[in-house]
């Protein structure tokens, strides 16, 4: 008769949100609160992820899907499914073991996360520097000197920084 049963696997008819209950003849039972089964035919329900501390809830857990977390302000997600929260830094900085540090001269970071990256070397493409780089912004490359019209000159390359880690202003 029509119990949650098929010829192959008696659990195959248990819908998402339920589990195949070994305690009572493999009848489908609803997942308990704070647990879920995202697919049919499951023999157990998975415990819902809890977004605690630096994590905050982006999507509540339901009987058929896990909770989803993101990070509280001042932090950003890392890893699959936001498995970690990492501290934000300011633009022009990178996170080190000792905290947020300014980008070294010749490097930049235009985001609140990630590492400082070297300025583009315009000369590798036969171009010149149109706009100087800063710790927050990459240089802007312009046309090569040969492409300039007569009488025009390229922008002067940046002078050495007075302080390490800072570009000239």
């Amino acid at each position: 008769f029509e119990r949650t049963r098929s010829l192959q696997d008696p659990c195959s008819n248990c819908p998402a949100g339920t589990f195949c209950d070994n305690n009572r003849n493999q009848i489908c039972s609803p997942c308990p609160p704070n647990s879920f089964s995202s697919a049919g035919g499951q023999r157990t329900c998975d415990i819902c992820r809890q977004c605690k501390g630096v994590f905050r809830t982006r999507k509540e857990c339901s009987s058929t899907s896990n909770a989803e977390c993101d990070c509280t302000p001042g932090f950003h997600c890392l890893g699959a499914g936001c498995s970690m929260c990492e501290q934000d830094c300011k633009q022009g900085q990178e996170l080190t073991k000792k905290g947020c540090k300014d980008c070294c001269f010749g490097t930049f970071n235009d985001q609140k996360r990630g590492i400082c990256r070297p300025w583009t070397n315009c000369s590798l493409d036969g171009k010149s520097v149109l706009v100087n780089g800063t710790k927050e912004r990459d240089v802007v490359c312009g046309p090569s000197p040969a492409d300039l019209s007569p009488g025009a000159s390229s922008v002067t390359p940046p002078a050495p920084a007075r302080e390490p880690g800072h570009s000239p202003q």
């Epitope: 119990r3 949650t4 308990p32």
Partner: antibody
Framework: QVQLQESGPGLVKPSETLSLTCTVS????????WSWIRQPPGKGLEWIGR???????NYNPSLKSRVTMSVDTSKNQFSLKLSSVTAADTAVYYC?????????????????WGQGTTVTVSS | EIVMTQSPATLSLTPGERATLSCRAS???????LSWFQQIPGQAPRLLIY???TRATGIPARFSGSGSGTDFTLTISSLQPEDFAVYYC?????????FGQGTKVEIK
């Protein structure tokens, strides 16, 4: 707290289809099975079947060929249809929340019932 | 299906007496899935006991349940006027869920 309310015609003609709706208030219909039970006059309780919020069903074999259950989660309602009725289907029809587990896997029986609605099959 | 048989069909007692109601299953039922209901005439059944021995919310301590396997018992230690009603056992261990035929506790 969760409350259930049955509604539908009190009188159905023989050979026609009995249709009842149970409205869930004070809580969500989601994540539970929901049962229908009936009680003929002066007799005991008979389980008709149950439905999960996804629409998955289990029916009593004695009624299976005539029973259809459905659910409308947007309205927090579930429904019973019983076709080809006869006088033997005259009864008080109850809806109830089916058994469920708490977080510690303690099992609770049919803990919430509607007050019941009387259906008479007569021409 | 699992057949639930209750005895006696009727129990005639006076207020203050002890009531012992029996429920027997045609095959073994895990006690987690055995419930007792009380039904007062004109009202819906009310869950009294679940898991064979756990009182539902708001149920007085004079009601107790026991048993395992195929034999289960509901005991009312001292009958109160409001306890005269019909009592049903029910299993949801295996489909289809089944009820006993009921025991009527009446005033002697």
């Amino acid at each position: 707290q969760v409350q259930l309310q049955e509604s539908g015609p009190g009188l159905v003609k023989p050979s026609e289809t009995l249709s009842l709706t149970c409205t869930v208030s004070g809580g969500s219909i989601s994540s539970y099975y929901w049962s229908w039970i009936r009680q003929p006059p002066g007799k005991g309780l008979e389980w008709i079947g149950r439905i999960y919020t996804s629409g998955s069903t289990n029916y009593n074999p004695s009624l299976k060929s005539r029973v259809t259950m459905s659910v409308d989660t947007s309205k927090n309602q579930f429904s019973l249809k019983l076709s080809s009725v006869t006088a033997a289907d005259t009864a008080v029809y109850y809806c109830a929340r089916d058994g469920w587990y708490d977080e510690d896997y303690n099992y609770y029986g049919m803990d919430v019932w509607g007050q019941g609605t009387t259906v008479t099959v007569s021409s | 299906e699992i057949v639930m048989t209750q005895s006696p069909a009727t129990l005639s007692l006076t207020p203050g007496e002890r009531a012992t109601l029996s429920c027997r299953a045609s095959q073994s039922v895990s006690s987690n899935y055995l419930s007792w209901f009380q039904q007062i005439p004109g009202q819906a059944p009310r869950l009294l006991i679940y898991g064979a021995s756990t009182r539902a919310t708001g149920i007085p301590a004079r009601f107790s349940g026991s048993g395992s396997g195929t034999d289960f018992t509901l005991t009312i230690s001292s009958l109160q006027p409001e306890d005269f009603a019909v009592y049903y056992c029910q299993q949801d261990y295996d489909l289809p869920w089944t009820f006993g035929q009921g025991t009527k506790v009446e005033i002697k």
